[in-house]
């Protein structure tokens, strides 16, 4: 994550800032993980493509009673504050695959870091 700091610059806030904040939160979760994250809860895997923020939110929201990911859920809501239609949403889930929250977070983190490096901030 250290290398991400190189993108920071004085002046107007770059569009990368929201993405960087989300990445930092996911890094915190993975680094501070002692017991199984969210007691090993399982969530739907998602397509890490267009609409992934909404898809990630819809998947993670099914984990209840896990304070470790609540900030992540709220930050994802920043990208996706209003509900997407059922038609849009149905294509975002890989509905035959469930993975542990910890793995979901790691996969999402890797993908977001890749987007950041490539300058795809939206």
């Amino acid at each position: 994550l250290t290398c991400l700091g190189g993108f920071a610059s004085p002046g107007p806030v770059p569009p990368s800032t929201a993405l960087r904040e989300l990445i930092e939160e996911l890094v915190n979760i993975t680094q501070n993980q002692k017991a199984p994250l969210c007691n090993g809860s399982m969530v739907w895997s998602i397509n890490l493509t267009a609409g992934m923020y909404c898809a990630a939110l819809e998947s993670l929201i099914n984990v209840s009673g896990c304070s470790a990911i609540e900030k992540t859920q709220r930050m994802l809501s920043g990208f996706c504050p209003h509900k997407v239609s059922a038609g849009q949403f149905s294509s975002l889930h890989v509905r035959d695959t469930k993975i542990e929250v910890a793995q979901f977070v790691k996969d999402l983190l890797l993908h977001l870091k890749k987007l950041f490096r490539e300058g795809q901030f939206n």
Epitope: V13, P15, T17, A18, E21, L22, L57, E58, I61, Q73, R74, M75, L76, S77, G78, F79, C80, P81, H82, K83, F121, N122
Partner: antibody
Framework: EVKLVESGGGLVKPGGSLKLSCAAS????????MSWVRQTPEKRLEWVAS???????YYPDSVKGRFTISRDNARNILYLQMSSLRSEDTAMYYC????????????WGQGTLVAVSA | DIVLTQSPASLAVSLGQRATISCKAS??????????MHWYQQKPGQSPKLLIY???NLESGIPARFSGSGSRTDFTLTINPVEADDVATYYC?????????FGGGTKLEIK
């Protein structure tokens, strides 16, 4: 501590324009969606506009085409540009941090009063 | 638009007793099993404050005296026991369908 401070309200004639501002502090402004919610003199609450962290905007039909929500992420300020104002737009306008459709309006400012009258 | 009807419009409750406020939606506000209904408290002269999100989840810092329940079209906010500081107007709000809408409010007073 999350703080939202609205300004820019006042008395305006029907058909006039007004721009509201909301200064935000105490949280990473760019990471959260923001909204404007108004409260009529009859104390009814009405959602007015929302903007995502990426700049996508959402409006009810009642203000679409007349109101524009925007944000300055460098200065942590939310705006609401209002034009073609009507008497029914008279209300207290609140700025709110929107934690999304799953969490609601998590924090509210103290509001700024807009009165539309001839 | 989804219409939210709150009842009663006002109620007076003795200190230490239970207050129950109802919110009925004109159509379901559930999304994949999650109820997109939230509750707010507005004290006199103040701005609204989030109490409950997704029908039954207590927002951080809100006392456990407040609780929410319900699904689809019928929702309830319960305050038990009521304290003097709870004098306020309470609003429900749905975020399942644009435009997001609020109930008309319920004014709570102490008997």
């Amino acid at each position: 501590e999350v703080k939202l401070v609205e300004s820019g309200g006042g008395l305006v004639k029907p058909g006039g324009s007004l721009k509201l501002s909301c200064a935000a502090s105490g949280f990473t402004f760019i990471s959260y969606a923001m909204s404007w919610v108004r409260q009529t003199p009859e104390k009814r609450l009405e959602w007015v506009a929302s903007i995502s962290s990426g700049g996508n905007t959402y409006y009810p039909d009642s203000v679409k085409g007349r109101f524009t929500i925007s944000r300055d992420n460098a200065r942590n300020i939310l705006y609401l540009q209002m034009s073609s104002l009507r008497s029914e737009d008279t209300a207290m306008y609140y700025c709110a941090r929107l934690d999304g459709y799953y969490f609601g309006f998590a924090y509210w400012g103290q509001g700024t009063l807009v009165a539309v009258s001839a | 638009d989804i219409v939210l009807t709150q009842s009663p419009a006002s109620l007076a409750v003795s200190l230490g007793q239970r207050a129950t406020i109802s919110c009925k939606a004109s159509e379901s506000v559930d999304n994949y099993g999650k109820s997109l209904m939230h509750w707010y408290q507005q004290k006199p002269g103040q701005s609204p404050k989030l109490l409950i999100y997704r029908a039954s989840n207590l927002e951080s810092g809100i006392p456990a005296r407040f609780s929410g329940s319900g699904s689809r079209t019928d929702f309830t906010l319960t305050i038990n026991p009521v304290e003097a500081d709870d004098v306020a107007t309470y609003y429900c709000q749905q975020s399942n369908e644009d435009p997001w809408t609020f109930g008309g409010g319920t004014k709570l007073e102490i008997k």
